[in-house]
């Protein structure tokens, strides 16, 4: 079998062999090495000599291969349009961001870039749950049986009905979607509004 | 050659202090993360502090923070470790670790051959 | 913090045997996984960087896959040299945090 071409090499149809990795250099009609993420070309490529890359510098970085000649520079995560920093920027990532808590993310170019408050649900609903946290709006959806919230708020989330029984005690008013049960001791007569129901 | 001397370890009573120096040749320290290692005898490895390549950024871990403090001097291609309050439970080798190709923390590439701290009464 | 839990945390193979060693973040961590070699009384070796790249000098048998937060190092034949402790380790964010190792241990 042939030997693997090694960068710089020619190239007359313009590809080459690992696009990830490599590059077409027109001027000479080569293939060159790209420099691995976290680094820059330093030195372009000849016929000659293959690319030379160096670290990117303090503050800045480079995701992937690349025949760029500088690296990016690192940007914080902006708490003015909502976003917190869940790791750093290194040379090899950009600052990882994510909305704040109890945000969610409004615009969205490659990244986010603005996130906004999430809405409120109203008693007897809660937020559905999603599988990723501040990727959209909340989206209310009713307590299921048997469960309540009593609040307007974007978190709360729906608690199941106080059992009576369970703390010794009898159920004085049903609990609804938004209100929990209410119970008193058995030995305690009915409230006055409650006395009409009661069985003489 | 590449290589990353560890030294400065030695026994010390608890309470105690001691400065661990890395000196590093053969790549540019002055554009690596650095790091400290350590692992008590037995055990395994334990993240314990680093700095970014200009020492902008400096990270320790909580079993150390507030006693430990990591600095560089790029002039002299070296990492240091100041530890004070030492502790028993600070005995271990302490390993220097670089990222030649990351100013900030990354996979460590490069490793001293560990200098030994024991702390005793 | 970001919890690394590695399994098994010893095995016993034969020269010629195929190991894998898991590792498992308890977030995800993208693809900031690194992988050591350690023999007793040495420092520790780079092995795979950014979870599947392997480090210059590192023999193809060895390989690492996975992202997000489930990983695996696979030697696809044990030599040896190669009985020693494996740990996996973290890069996403600090605290950095390892793995507890993996011994690889001649049956």
């Known amino acids: 079998s042939q030997p693997q071409a090694v960068p710089p090499y020619a190239s007359e149809n313009q590809t080459c062999r690992d696009q990830e990795k490599e590059y077409y250099e027109p001027q000479h009609r080569i293939c060159c090495s790209r420099c691995p993420p976290g680094t820059y070309v330093s030195a372009k490529c000849s016929r000659i000599r293959d690319t030379v890359c160096a670290t990117c510098a303090e503050n800045s970085y480079n995701e992937h291969w690349n025949y760029l000649t500088i690296c990016q520079l690192c940007r914080p995560c902006d708490p003015v349009m909502g976003l917190e920093e869940i790791a750093p920027c290194t040379s090899k990532r950009k600052t990882q961001c994510r909305c704040q808590p109890g945000m969610f993310c409004a615009a969205w170019a490659l990244e986010c870039t603005h996130c906004e408050l999430l809405s409120d649900c109203p008693p007897g609903t809660e937020a559905e749950l999603k599988d990723e946290v501040g990727k959209g709006n909340n989206h209310c959806v009713p307590c299921k049986a048997g469960h309540f919230q009593n609040t307007s708020s974007p978190s709360a989330r729906c608690q199941p009905h106080t059992r009576c029984e369970n703390q010794g005690l009898v159920e004085a008013a049903p609990g609804t979607a938004q209100s929990d049960t209410t119970c008193k001791n058995p030995l305690e007569p009915l409230p006055p509004e409650m006395s009409g129901t009661m069985l003489m | 050659e590449v290589q990353l001397v560890e030294s400065g370890g030695g026994l010390v009573k608890p309470g105690g202090s001691l400065r661990l120096s890395c000196a590093a040749s053969g790549f540019t320290f002055s554009t690596s993360g650095m790091n400290w290692v350590r692992q008590a005898p037995g055990k395994g490895l334990e993240w314990v502090s680093s700095v970014s390549s200009s020492g902008s950024y400096i990270y320790y871990a909580d079993s150390v923070k507030g006693r430990f403090t990591i600095s560089r001097d790029n002039a002299k291609n070296s990492l240091y470790l100041q530890m004070n309050s030492l502790r028993a439970e600070d005995t271990a080798v302490y390993y220097c670790?670089?990222?030649?190709?990351?100013?900030?923390?990354?996979?460590?590439?490069?490793w001293g051959q560990g200098t030994v701290v024991t702390v005793s009464s | 913090d970001i919890q690394m839990t590695q399994s098994p945390s010893s095995l016993s193979a034969s020269v010629g045997d195929r190991v894998t060693i898991t590792c498992r973040a308890s977030q995800s961590i993208s693809s900031d996984l690194n992988w050591y070699q350690q023999k007793p009384g040495k420092a520790p070796n780079l092995l795979i960087y950014a979870a599947s790249s392997l480090h210059s000098g590192v023999p193809s048998r060895f390989s690492g896959s996975g992202s997000g937060t489930d990983f695996t190092l696979t030697i696809s034949s044990l030599l040896p040299e190669d009985f020693a402790t494996y740990y996996c380790?973290?890069?996403?964010?600090?605290?950095?945090?390892f793995g507890g190792g993996t011994k690889v241990e001649i049956k």
């Open positions: 380790q973290q890069s996403y964010n600090t605290p950095l945090t």
């Open positions: 670790a670089g990222a030649r190709y990351n100013w900030h923390f990354d996979a460590s590439d490069i």
